[in-house]
Amino acid sequence: GALEVQVPEDPVVALVGTDATLCCSFSPEPGFSLAQLNLIWQLTDTKQLVHSFAEGQDQGSAYANRTALFPDLLAQGNASLRLQRVRVADEGSFTCFVSIRDFGSAAVSLQVAAPYSKPSMTLEPNKDLRPGDTVTITCSSYQGYPEAEVFWQDGQGVPLTGNVTTSQMANEQGLFDVHSILRVVLGANGTYSCLVRNPVLQQDAHSSVTITPQRSPTGAVEVQVPEDPVVALVGTDATLRCSFSPEPGFSLAQLNLIWQLTDTKQLVHSFTEGRDQGSAYANRTALFPDLLAQGNASLRLQRVRVADEGSFTCFVSIRDFGSAAVSLQVAAPYSKPSMTLEPNKDLRPGDTVTITCSSYRGYPEAEVFWQDGQGVPLTGNVTTSQMANEQGLFDVHSVLRVVLGANGTYSCLVRNPVLQQDAHGSVTITGQPMTFPPEA
């Protein structure tokens, strides 16, 4: 007649700083009342009390005030525990004891995790490098948990396991900073990449460094891209320009062209084996096939989204190899601001009013300026908030609190810093008493 208590078999994985639910359930008999229930959560190893419910009442958290039950669900047999703002130190086993007439218990494991940052790479020495020099490449990634796995490889995918030293240090919160050092002898040129994996989240963070010693290989392909970022409006098409100079007798069969995201190395589009291999990027990219033979390797990106913003690398390989990166800056114009007033009727000089200026669906974040009817800037008592929607576009709400004079005009200017596009709205408050908006 022991009470059956059920918990998940697999550990509960929780990110540091988030809330975790440790599930625990029992099957209440007909006529069961909470007055009969004794529920205790405790740390399995130390038996430290975490949370309890007894004598028909939640006895509260005994664990740094970060735990809670689900009181409305207890009567249905849900004895789960909510653990707030998870810390590394919370990792371990928690036991759920349930006693009604009979008694049962089960333990659930909490596995804490935190993603590692994108690795930063440093080189020592970092100038006047020549083939044959020994260099030390350091790959650093921060604030992850648990300890990371680190892998190195060269530009051909060959694993580099010799001459690697990896150290991991925990900070006060128990999060690890990982530093992995690779010592290599330089060839004519080389790419070295470091991959830091969080084994619990199966999350990979990687970076690479390409070292071209001073005596660069002869005849490398010169790849040209615009220096300035390409600015594209959300929803429109953008052309990322890239060109090379084909030699006499050049044929497309010799060309390997790869576009990829500079940071993640994600393939975007490729042309190999004499043909367009198509888009690997949500089917929104295209080359200019008729212009490739003339050295035009540009990429067309259709229906641009905020998430496309960043650096794209154009790799061109014929006999030799060259690459260059072009930045895409995404933008969206802000709508004409709408103005609201609170309170909006029976206004008199001396009243304090709140004027809200709202402008929608712009990118990137806006700059907001207020001024009065004489062009005098109003900077005190302004609060501006910007919220991104699912598409990454921002809605901006700016609130100005002012004391009314006999009459006054208040204008709000919303600027898109990339497009240098200004959208403005104004409100004029006159008369006494006043009503806003004016009645017909």
Partner: antibody
Framework: EVQLVQSGAEVKKPGSSVKVSCKAS????????IHWVRQAPGQGLEWMGY????????DYAQKFQGRVTLTADKSTSTAYMELSSLRSEDTAVYYC??????????????WGQGTTVTVSS | EIVLTQSPDFQSVTPKEKVTITCRAS?????MNWYQQKPDQSPKPWIY???NLASGVPSRFSVSVSGTDHTLTINSLEAEDAATYYC?????????FGQGTKLEIK
């Protein structure tokens, strides 16, 4: 079209050597490593080693160390695998394969058609 | 040396059935690749960098990872999937393959 074309079948006596060729076309031969993988009858795939045709760096599986030699001729875009001191258990299909991709995603994207080597007295 | 152990060695399955093949690594690998081989043919790239389908591979194939276990799943087996599947790693020397899993259609 990217292709690796291997030389034809060979029948060899125990104790002798065999040299298999693998001619690459349709891509820059020096940009990717060439690996050799063998498969005994009814068995799985077994890695033998690789060569970087550009630097001519090689690395061999312990099992074949001292018995296998990998070479590459840039002028003809051809890789070679020579296996010496042949014994009957070396009877297998020998494949060359290109290890391709971009950092850090690499895999064997193109394989030769295979060369059958039979070792028999 | 990282040893890759595939299970099962052999599986006989009816069409439309869900199939799983597990490749267990003796220690962590950076990426796992999978190849398909049919009788008297060279191996073909099937899945690269753990979970990316190679060109032309149907979407019924997928891979999930738990610790050092990489599991290849075929959601609804078709006759053309009858083949031997190999996993492969090169996170550290030597490069190694799993022993292979042969899928046969009942």
């Amino acid at each position: 079209e990217v292709q690796l074309v291997q030389s034809g079948a060979e029948v060899k006596k125990p104790g002798s050597s065999v040299k298999v060729s693998c001619k690459a076309s349709g891509y820059s031969f020096t940009s990717y490593t060439i690996h050799w993988v063998r498969q005994a009858p009814g068995q799985g795939l077994e890695w033998m080693g690789y060569i970087n045709p550009n630097s001519r760096n090689t690395d061999y599986a312990q099992k074949f160390q001292g018995r296998v030699t990998l070479t590459a001729d840039k002028s003809t875009s051809t890789a070679y695998m020579e296996l010496s001191s042949l014994r009957s258990e070396d009877t297998a299909v020998y494949y060359c394969a290109r290890y391709s991709g971009s950092t850090p995603y690499w895999y064997f994207d193109v394989w030769g058609q295979g060369t059958t080597v039979t070792v028999s007295s | 040396e990282i040893v890759l152990t595939q299970s099962p060695d052999f599986q006989s399955v009816t069409p439309k059935e869900k199939v799983t093949i597990t490749c267990r690594a003796s220690s962590s690998v950076s990426y796992m690749n999978w190849y398909q081989q049919k009788p008297d043919q060279s191996p073909k790239p099937w899945i690269y960098a753990t979970s990316n389908l190679a060109s032309g591979v149907p979407s019924r194939f997928s891979v999930s990872v738990s610790g050092t276990d990489h599991t290849l799943t075929i959601n609804s087996l078709e006759a053309e999937d009858a083949a031997t599947y190999y996993c492969q790693q090169w996170s550290s020397n030597p490069l190694t393959f799993g022993q292979g899993t042969k899928l046969e259609i009942k």
